[in-house]
């Protein structure tokens, strides 16, 4: 029997992918593993092999199709398996009845542009990347903006809760350099959580205007 | 090797009771994911209720939800199925099933490794 404390936990970014986490106390570094993907209503499966990320866990990426293709539906149940190679044979280490709108991590936003600066505010704009259809405009974004001085986990959140791809930051420091980030969550699904951060933007706001001599 | 008896099946009314105990011997039941599974006459095997090994989640299918109740006892090493508001739909064989690994599935029955040699439970007035 499998020893130890194990923990399974996969994400479905909505189109083509479903990457996975598996940790288990007490496995060996050097065995071969990997995620199967069985779902139950439709003619294709899928595997990855699973890779280490540290010493007693290991990740991989279901790829099902074309980064945009829509391969599930919130109707489908994929069973997860972990199994790994014993001698010569495979064997199931861990198992989940994987319901992907239920768990969903979409990527994190893409094409981060300054769309007009002045001395105290910027308007940013970005898009979202691999996101299905279904969720027409049912998202919400956070974003963050990095001060001089500052840490990213210091900067305060600014939420929004509607399908806004841009944002328009406010009383700014002149002449000074920043950097912003967004991430963006579906309102559906129990498990589904934020996407990463995305790629910094940075950008400097305008110097202020010299005053003139009297 | 391990080895799963099912009992407490029988005839019951329908909107009546039953709970089935599933006895497992070779092994204990915190290494293995258990398994609920029936089959009705004509139709496929389909997943009822599972718990998971190690951290006891427990998991229904839609069906049974709010009907049936899974449970253990590691002391008596036996899995229970409690099972109310019952329906002639429920008419089936019940398995008790388990799977050296961590996790369970009601989608998939044949990732079980152990099985049970069944116990009818009919719903008939």
């Known amino acids: 029997a499998v020893n130890g404390t194990s923990q399974f936990t996969c994400f479905y970014n909505s189109r083509a992918n479903i990457s996975c986490v598996w940790s288990q106390d007490g496995a060996l570094q050097d065995t071969s593993c990997q995620v199967h993907a069985w779902p139950d209503r439709r003619r294709w499966n899928q595997t990855c092999e699973l890779l280490p990320v540290s010493q007693a866990s290991w990740a991989c990426n279901l790829i099902l199709g074309a980064p945009d293709s829509q391969k599930l539906t919130t109707v489908d149940i994929v069973t997860l398996r972990v199994l790994c190679r014993e001698g010569v044979r495979w064997r199931v280490m861990a198992i989940q009845d994987f319901k992907p709108f239920e768990n969903l991590r979409l990527m994190a936003p893409i094409s981060l542009q300054v769309v007009h600066v002045e001395t105290h505010r910027c308007n940013i704009s970005w898009e979202i990347s691999q996101a299905s259809h279904y969720f027409e405009r049912h998202l919400e974004f956070e974003a963050r903006t990095l001060s001089p001085g500052h840490t990213w986990e210091e900067a305060p959140l600014l939420t929004l809760k509607q399908k806004q791809e841009w944002i328009c930051l406010e009383t700014l420091t002149p002449d000074t350099q920043y950097e912003f980030q967004v991430r963006v969550k579906p309102l559906q699904g129990e498990f589904t959580t934020w996407s990463p951060w995305s790629q910094p933007l940075a950008f400097r706001t305008k110097p202020a205007a010299l005053g003139k001599d009297t | 090797q391990v080895q799963l008896v099912e009992s407490g099946g029988g005839l019951v009314q329908p909107g009546g009771s039953l709970r089935l105990s599933c006895a497992v011997s070779?092994?204990?039941?915190?290494?293995?994911?258990i398994g609920w599974i029936r089959q009705a006459p004509g139709k496929q095997r389909e997943g009822v209720s599972c718990?998971?090994?190690?951290?006891?989640?427990?998991y229904y299918a839609d069906y049974v939800k709010g009907r049936f109740t899974i449970s253990k006892d590691n002391a008596k090493n036996t899995v229970y199925l409690q099972m109310i508001s019952l329906k002639p739909e429920d008419t089936a064989v019940y398995y008790c099933?388990?799977?050296?690994?961590?996790?369970?599935?009601?989608?998939?029955?044949?990732?079980?490794?152990?099985w049970g040699q069944g116990t009818q439970v009919t719903v008939s007035s």
């Open positions: 718990m998971s090994r190690s951290d006891d989640k427990t």
């Open positions: 099933a388990a799977v050296d690994a961590y996790g369970c599935s009601l989608v998939q029955p044949t990732t079980y490794d152990y």
């Open positions: 070779g092994g204990t039941l915190h290494d293995y994911g």
